[in-house]
Interface confidence: medium
């Protein structure tokens, strides 16, 4: 595994509509979205992480649109905007301006934004605080993940992509150690030779000395 994408785990609580259910991929790490959007440090504090198998990951849950006509009710039912609304109003939280944006999907907000409490309007996510990486009907952006203490940030959270975290140098995470970064092995057993260095996604690789380590490795 390249370690850049997490395996699917329990989805966060999300809103759904007849346009399809949208859920983040890679495990629930966000709080229940509300109609208020996210503001300031409180959103960062909400960026907790649920346990579950997660190899070295691009911390971003990917939004998947399931083409199922199922209503997901989590406390409140989504008010569906008529599909004829091909143009939506976009409220920019960060600079307080409004702009109109054409939306080919009609009632869905574009990546980097979420559904406003005002029908037909979308709010921009705040850089470094929240994100959405697909067209969506969420009432709040997904909170950016904070890298764990044994990880370092590979790329920062943007409005359309979650933080990418990886194990710190000298440690790795793979399918067998999904929850934590493990120390890289110091060397190979007797009779074997190292053919690949440790990476954030894999331990060193050893082959038998007699195998010929310049070929097919």
């Amino acid at each position: 595994a390249s370690g850049t994408e997490a395996a699917a785990a329990t989805p966060s609580k999300v809103w759904g509509s007849s346009a399809g259910r949208i859920e983040p991929r890679g495990g629930g790490r966000g709080a229940l979205p509300t109609s208020m959007g996210q503001h300031g440090p409180s959103a960062r504090a909400r960026a907790g992480r649920a346990p579950g198998p997660r190899p070295a990951r691009e911390a971003s849950p990917r939004l998947r649109v399931h083409k199922t006509f199922k209503f997901v009710v989590v406390g409140v039912l989504l008010q569906v905007v008529p599909s004829s609304a091909a143009t939506i109003k976009l409220h920019d939280q960060s600079i307080g301006t409004q702009q109109w944006e054409h939306s080919p999907l009609g009632e869905l907000c574009p990546p980097g934004s979420h559904r406003s409490e005002h029908p037909g309007a979308c709010n921009r996510c705040t850089e470094g605080v929240g994100y959405t990486n697909a067209s969506n009907n969420l009432f709040a952006c997904l909170p950016c993940t904070a890298c764990k203490s044994d990880e370092e940030e590979r790329s920062p959270c943007t409005t359309t992509r979650n933080t990418a975290c990886q194990c710190k140098p000298g440690t790795f995470r793979n399918d067998n150690s999904a929850e934590m970064c493990r120390k890289c092995s110091r060397g190979c057993p007797r009779g074997m030779v190292k053919v690949k260095d440790c990476t954030p996604w894999s331990d060193i690789e050893c082959v038998h000395k007699e195998s010929g380590n310049g070929h097919n490795i």
Epitope: R190, G191, V193, K194, H208, K209, E210, S211, G212, N213, G214, H215, N216
Partner: antibody
Framework: QVTLKESGPGILQPSQTLSLTCSFS??????????VSWIRQPSGKGLEWLAH???????RYNPSLKSRLKISKDTSSNQVFLKITSVDTADTATYYC???????????WGQGTTLTVSS | QAVVTQESALTTSPGETVTLTCRSS?????????ANWVQEKPDHLFTGLIG???NRAPGVPARFSGSLIGDKAALTITGAQTEDEAIYFC?????????FGGGTKLTVL
């Protein structure tokens, strides 16, 4: 261009110690994956592997002859040595040194040095 | 110590495909035996053909290939040529040492 060349005494008497030298060029024994083996061939017969030394000074020996063999190397002078103690007539053979390279095979061979053990 | 057995002699014709095999007295040959194949031509000219069961070294013609067939290691020459007439030795690795077979004399008529 990889070359290997063996040298030895030619003739020994039983119970003496055989000292063989393999001088090579075209590769370095400090390179990971490299190694040199000693192999012998009695006249008209098959091959018998004797010993191997790796780039990291790890060594392997033929179990049947282990107590009599000692392999060593001088990386800086590109030489590998083999000592066989207490020789007898059964050790009469042509002795080859061969490189084991990165493809895991005995790829380059010397032309051999002949030993006759005779009283 | 294990014994490695090869056909003592085989004959083939130019252009034909011929397979030489290498059997171990200690059971099936596996990739952990890192089967090697060495060619000996007249005047004690040795060339390593195959290492690690199927790794063909640079410079070795593509008609030579190594594999495992059943419980044996095999060297296949696809489209034998007259210059392939030689003695072929296989060698198997047993945990910490090599054992050579007795060699197969291949005649290309």
């Amino acid at each position: 261009q990889v070359t290997l060349k063996e040298s030895g005494p030619g003739i020994l008497q039983p119970s003496q110690t055989l000292s063989l030298t393999c001088s090579f060029s075209g590769f370095s024994l400090s390179t990971s994956g490299m190694g040199v083996s000693w192999i012998r061939q009695p006249s008209g017969k098959g091959l018998e592997w004797l010993a191997h030394i790796y780039w990291d000074d790890d060594k392997r020996y033929n179990p049947s002859l282990k107590s009599r063999l000692k392999i060593s190397k001088d990386t800086s002078s590109n030489q590998v040595f083999l000592k066989i103690t207490s020789v007898d007539t059964a050790d009469t053979a042509t002795y080859y040194c061969t490189r084991r390279g990165e493809y895991g095979n005995f790829d380059y061979w010397g032309q051999g040095t002949t030993l006759t053990v005779s009283s | 110590q294990a014994v490695v057995t090869q056909e003592s002699a085989l004959t083939t014709s130019p252009g034909e495909t011929v397979t030489l095999t290498c059997r171990s007295s200690s059971g099936a040959v596996t990739t952990s035996n890192f089967a090697n194949w060495v060619q000996e031509k007249p005047d004690h000219l040795f060339t390593g053909l195959i290492g690690g069961t199927n790794n063909r070294a640079p410079g070795v013609p593509a008609r030579f290939s190594g594999s495992l067939i059943g419980d044996k290691a095999a060297l296949t020459i696809t489209g034998a040529q007259t210059e392939d007439e030689a003695i072929y030795f296989c060698a198997l690795w047993y945990s910490n040492h090599w054992v050579f077979g007795g060699g197969t004399k291949l005649t290309v008529l």
